[in-house]
Amino acid sequence: QKKGAPHDLKCVTNNLQVWDCYWKAPSGTGRGTDYEVCIENRSHSCYQLEKTNIKIPALSHGDYEITINSLHDFGSSTSKFTLNEQNVSLIPDTPEILNLSADFSTSTLYLKWNDRGSVFPHHSNVIWEIKILRKESMELVKLVTHNTTLNGKDTLHHWSWASDMPLECAIHFVEIRCYIDSLHFSGRKEWSDWSPVKNISWMPDSQTKVFPQDKVILVGSDITFCCISQEKVLSALIGHTNCPLIHLDGENVAIKIHNISVSASSGTNVVFTTEDNIFGTVIFAGYPPDTPQQLNCETHDLKEILCRWNPGRATALVGPRATSYTLLESFSGKYVRFKRAEAPTNGSYQLFFQMLPNQEIYNFTLNAHNPLGRSESTILVNITEKVYPHTPTSFKVKDINSTAVKLSWHLPGNFAKINFLCQIEIKKSNTVQEQRNVTIKGVENSSYLVALDKLNPYTVYTFRIRCSTETFWKWSKWSNKKQHLTTEAIPSKGPDTWREWSSDGKNLIIYWKPLPINEANGKILSYNVSCSSDEETQSLSEIPDPQHKAEIQLDKNDYIISVVAKNSVGSSPPSKIASMEIPNDDLKIEQVVGMGKGILLTWHYDPNMTCDYVIKWCNSSRSEPCLMDWRKVPSNSTETVIESDQFRPGVRYNFFLYGCRNQGYQLLRSMIGYIEELAPTVAPNFTVEDTSADSILVKWEDIPVEELRGFLRGYLFYFGKGERDTSKMRVLESGRSDIKVKNITDISQKTLRIADLQGKTSYHLVLRAYTDGGVGPEKSMYVVTKENS
């Protein structure tokens, strides 16, 4: 175009519907210039105007010829331009912030603006740039892009931004601009101008303030603190660590803490100091709640559900910042909250949830929440399978009869729909405990009853009980123990009875043993002894317990003696024994030796013995009648071990084995023996009966049984040259080769001649007896042989 004609045609649009085209006037033209603008499109349009710009409707795609005629005083000039959409710039109108507000407690800015979308013909993407500036010096803090879409109508947009620095610390400015990224527009797209700036500031009073106050943050976070002050701030500390000051407007300062450490329960102090004062705030650095661990729900009573859990990792936040828990049941929509006062027991927390009528399956979600976050755990539970009964209370025992009792107890809860498995522990004194399991139908009223049989009469039992449901989840704790004595019953057996004739053979002495408690079935009060023959029955007067012996004058006819034990309920069956022994001519006395504590006796099976066998024993040295104790063993036995606290080693006892038929006893074997053999306590007394020049005859006596302390097995006779009261060695001193020893194993031998001796020589003689228990002490003598004649 010529310089004297209109030139530099440019077109812009702010809404894609109208193009605003402007040009530069020809040089030298004044105010009174008119323009004729013609646009060559389908219909030739011309416009008359007095200014250097024109708004025209947006042209469709393609090239258009624009003719601008300038008409002025000194003539006219014409310029032709080719106009295409690609030559047009899209520059949106300057946006305006409708509202800027702040939430100081969260340091968040809230921005509101209108996109004026109604002026645009079709949908377009819009990019917004939001600029945050801080301090009076308007330092750029943040430049963010935010995408929206134009949808043909005016839309309000909201945007928020959380500041890393508390908003109270400094003035914050915000401005926005936009860029319309229209797919339908092929021209140049440009950013709008920045909006007028808006700001937010905190109105301080005259007091110095530190921000934020009581903030809860995640361990490891970064945080900024500031002090709004009229005085010069000299230092800042977090805990004991000095922090570099960041200067804000006026005397205001800030500090930035990176990667903050976990706080103590009282929080972490942040302190600013001035010349004269100190100002503080507390920060609580902790963790969000961990997922509740080991969530478990059970019921004690089918009325209330108890859910327990472990909080997991500690949050380091306490008091009002501690984790709060809510237990939600999704089928019913009901929930309960954990009250902080219900402090955790041994590291686990618990909550009670009221059971709902006719609901057995519960879907629990436990929500944990603290200022830093939330977490949850879920559990699906059929509560009838998770019954942990209370400890049974009011546990009582009542008699039914002597072998049965009734147990009653209280188990709180409504268990009408389930069965219990209860375990009863039965303990008899000094015996192992027995456990019996019983199944009981659950009831609504909490009272339970069970009968227990197969007990022993007159026995002290200790009972206790625990219960679980039949489907078994947990045993209840054991109830208190209840001690109970069952009632008496008649004695189940007659006393174990024996008899001996007195030493003069005129009286029969009857002995019996007290009945064991499990046969006495009560306290034995007395005994009845009676004596019967074919002609008559004679009853002795009642013998009170604890007397266990009676004496009757009897002739040598055969009598049957009966002994009956009586308690408060009644009498035992009679124990019967014949007064006379069945003779046995073929009897030898045998030797037996025990095993330290007792003695094993064996015998051959004898089918004639129909009632039992009796082993009787006594101390050999005691006078008649020989009875220390007796033991009955069944008729099918062929051996027994006799043990008694009265047995002593080295004491000789007589043992008698009797067999019984028709209440009559026959002596089958007679034995003497020791529980344990010991060495003799004395040496045999010996004398020299005769001496010659080359021999000596020695004679000795028996050792009494009491001193023998075992079965005599032989003698040891030592002899050798030796003189009394000299330094020459004694016979028994070791290492002497001239000592001679004779072992005499024939215990009936009582003399010994020693030959081949030297005449007129002194000999030392020593005699010792031995048993299987050892060698006894020595007896010694010095003898001088005669001179050779």
Epitope: D205, Q207, T208, V210, Q213, D214, L237, G239, H240, S266, G267, N269, V271, T273, D276, N277, I278, F279, G280, T281, V282, G319, P320
Partner: antibody
Amino acid sequence: QVQLVESGGGVVQPGRSLRLSCAASGFTFSSYGMDWVRQAPGKGLEWVAVIWYDGSNKFYADSVRGRFTISRDNSQNTLYLQMNSLRAEDTAVYYCARELWFGELLSPFDFWGQGTLVTVSS
Amino acid sequence: EIVLTQSPGTLSLSPGGRATLSCRASQSVSSSYLAWYQQKPGQAPRLLIYGASSRATGIPDRFSGSGSGTDFTLTISRLEPEDFAVYYCQQYGSSPFTFGPGIKVDIK
């Protein structure tokens, strides 16, 4: 057990000086901030001064700033309050108090002495 | 400075009764920096509550504290004979550390 024993109180004329001491025992004195608090007869409590556990900082109530000096001797487990230019309105029972938090700043006062009476009178 | 006001000035109650003592600050106080003390005649004060709600060592659980910002409360749930005394609130978050004027709890 923690014990704080104040001494040095008495009757003094206006304009004169007095030095109060507080002997501490039963705790690690050098790890706790210490304060002086006073109570005029029949009146409420008034905070007077604080000194940090290490003695690095001291702060005062406006009513005593420039006249009173708080100090401590950690080797002797003793806290001091040097009171100059005393006035009638300084008449009070003076308590020394230990701050609750071990090695912390800005704490409540968990242990107090039995107090010593300062009477400023002509 | 932060001014603390306490109300009521005197509280007359019977043993077993519930006492609610109020403390108001002239400007916001961090709850972490508010304490309550009890003082009996002729004795030094005794720390009851710190951090607005935490009980000091050995303080019975009938004493509880609550509140935030400018309004704080000390509650004694069941007054025992030994609880009749003067109660002070204190802020220790910025110097000068200030006490309230005190509330006297006496026997009705």
